[in-house]
């Protein structure tokens, strides 16, 4: 056959669906690879063809669209499973072609089993809620297009294994779940089960997401440098190791980039000739505030190094701060026999 633009296996779109539930999978060609949509392609006389490779097999085979009750079907650029089976797992390819044009992409589809408490190997999306921040909502994700607007599904929400009813600060409101005031105790996995009828059959859609309660913007402050500070003086003799920690606290800020860096005499350590190493460690609070520590180390400090200016800098979306370390050369203790004796006029 003629050459086909092959976009390969699109592992970025690792699609996971639950066993025994409906799944609608759009051909990724129109979403991520081509500059036109399915309607335009269809009007231009292009045909969309689907095929697949079963798990642990190399053989590409056509998808059987003649299964009982149309279990697998195609509608425009969507491949439908009503419902999925475990052995539908594999790599699926959609190919758009006519006599003069061809483009195709493959993507992995994994059919996943869940237990009665909705635990599964499914990768869960994370939704962040601000702590004590007034009413916030999460919405049952990825249920659009499964049923027409005329169908009124029933939606049941769970936290972990518990059906959400009479929770003191969490209220189910159809497709939404409202948190009147988010607390740390609201951290966890939330599942919505959407039940709807179709052609005399009942289908269930299960969607689980992780709620993570994070620091509120009300509590957010610019970076706080805990070390270096005015109480600690780094007093060293030449030849000793100089270790100065820069410890900075960052409030949680959505999508903020937290940065810590040292300057020595106003220059970045990479831009100067002295032998400096910097080691960084990061810890996070339960509400995703961050503490970064960068330890500046000079193995064998010289008297010149002890005269330099060592400044710790920190930056977040809330602002930029800097603090200089107090570094000085230790005055050697007097040697009694020579120096003190001289003071008494001894020669």
């Amino acid at each position: 056959s003629e050459r086909c633009d092959d976009w390969g296996l699109d592992t970025m779109r690792q699609i996971q669906v639950f066993e025994d539930e409906p799944a609608r999978i759009k051909c990724p060609l129109f979403e991520h690879f081509l500059k036109f949509n399915y309607s335009t392609a269809h009007s231009a006389g292009l045909t969309l063809i689907w095929y697949w490779t079963r798990q642990d097999r190399d053989l590409e085979e056509p998808i059987n669209f003649r299964l009982p009750e149309n279990r697998i079907s195609k509608e425009k650029d969507v491949l439908w499973f009503r419902p999925t089976l475990l052995n539908d797992t594999g790599n699926y390819t959609c190919m758009l072609r006519n006599t003069t044009y061809c483009s195709k992409v493959a993507f992995p589809l994994e059919v996943v089993q869940k237990d009665s408490c909705f635990n599964s190997p499914m990768k869960l999306p994370v939704h962040k809620l601000y702590i004590e921040y007034g009413i916030q909502r999460i919405t049952c994700p990825n249920v659009d297009g499964y049923f027409p607007s005329s169908v009124k599904p029933t939606i049941t929400w769970y936290m972990g294994c518990y059906k959400i009813q009479n929770f003191n600060n969490v209220i189910p409101e159809g497709m939404n779940l409202s948190f009147l005031i988010a607390l740390i105790s609201n951290n966890g996995n939330y599942t919505c089960v959407v039940t709807y009828p179709e052609n005399g059959r009942t289908f269930h859609l299960t969607r689980t997401l992780t709620v993570k309660v994070v620091g509120s913007p009300k509590n957010a402050v610019p970076p706080v440098i805990h070390s270096p500070n005015d109480h600690v003086v780094y007093e060293k003799e030449p030849g000793e190791e100089l270790l100065i920690p820069c410890t900075v606290y960052f409030s949680f800020l959505m999508d903020s980039r937290n940065e810590v860096w040292w300057t020595i005499d106003g220059k970045k350590p990479d831009d100067i000739t002295i032998d400096v190493t910097i080691n960084e460690s990061i810890s996070h609070s339960r509400t995703e505030d961050e503490t970064r520590t960068q330890i500046l180390s000079i193995k064998k400090v010289t008297s010149e190094d002890l005269k330099r200016s060592y400044v710790c800098h920190a930056r977040s979306a809330k602002g930029e701060v800097a603090k200089a370390a107090k570094v000085k050369q230790k005055v050697p203790a007097p040697r009694y026999t020579v120096e003190l004796a001289c003071g008494f006029g001894a020669t």
Partner: antibody, heavy 119, light 108 residues
């Protein structure tokens, strides 16, 4: 009114075992509360033993408590602490406490139950 | 493991006076520090969270301050009802959950 009540304390022989129970009233464990056991030896300070997230079941234990002390959720309103190989050093009042992981919002303590390890 | 060091172990002050209790963390814990008051035969009672936020019903004579590794609880206009043992508690994350050793406050 939200309340925690500890029970199961008493006199136990050295090397013996004991299970303490913390019963919640006015709320249940469907929300992901962080329930902890804290002990206090006579005339001494507070010592955190172990904690459990009541919804997910994830647990945390102090390094010294691992192996001898086990925290569990046994119902939607009870948390237990199983203690084994007890010694005189384990003599203390054992408190059940809620949300020590973020006391800002819903910190709650029980009155405690006394455990005496003696022959 | 984190170590919370409280000083002094005991402090004596006159009614109407001021008491200062210090708590030092062995690693930075941001603002994640709580203070508790415990009277004999009772469980601890939360006074202050997030280093400086007063719990509901706690009089403004109690003041918390500090961040990082150094924290202070100040009790001003001391009353006889303030006779108790005071504990700090770190709650930055599960690696830093710990109580300080306690400070006994005695009225002269």
């Amino acid at each position: 009114q939200e309340q925690l009540v500890e029970s199961g304390g008493g006199l136990v022989q050295p090397e013996g075992s004991l299970t303490l129970t913390c019963k919640a009233s006015g709320f249940d464990f469907s929300s992901n509360y962080y329930m902890c056991w804290v002990r206090q030896a006579p005339g001494k300070g507070l010592e955190l033993i172990a904690c459990i997230y009541t919804n997910s079941g994830n647990t945390w234990s102090a390094s010294w408590a691992k192996g001898r002390f086990t925290i569990s959720k046994t119902s939607s309103t009870t948390v237990t602490l199983q203690m084994t190989s007890l010694t005189a050093a384990d003599t203390a009042t054992y408190f059940c406490a809620r949300d020590l992981n973020y006391p800002d919002t819903s910190n709650l303590w029980g009155q405690g139950t006394l455990v005496t390890v003696s022959s | 493991d984190i170590v919370m060091t409280q000083t002094p172990a005991s402090v004596e002050a006159a009614v109407g006076g001021t008491v200062t209790i210090k708590c030092q963390a062995s690693q930075s814990i941001g603002y994640y520090l709580a203070w508790y008051q415990q009277k004999p035969g009772q469980p601890p009672k939360l006074l202050i969270s997030r280093a400086s936020t007063l719990a509901s019903g706690v009089p403004s004579r109690f003041k918390g301050s500090g961040s990082g590794t150094q924290f202070t609880l100040t009790i001003s206009d001391l009353e006889s009802a303030d006779v108790a043992t005071y504990y700090c508690q770190s709650y930055y994350n599960s690696d830093s959950d710990a109580f300080g050793g306690g400070t006994e406050v005695v009225v002269k």
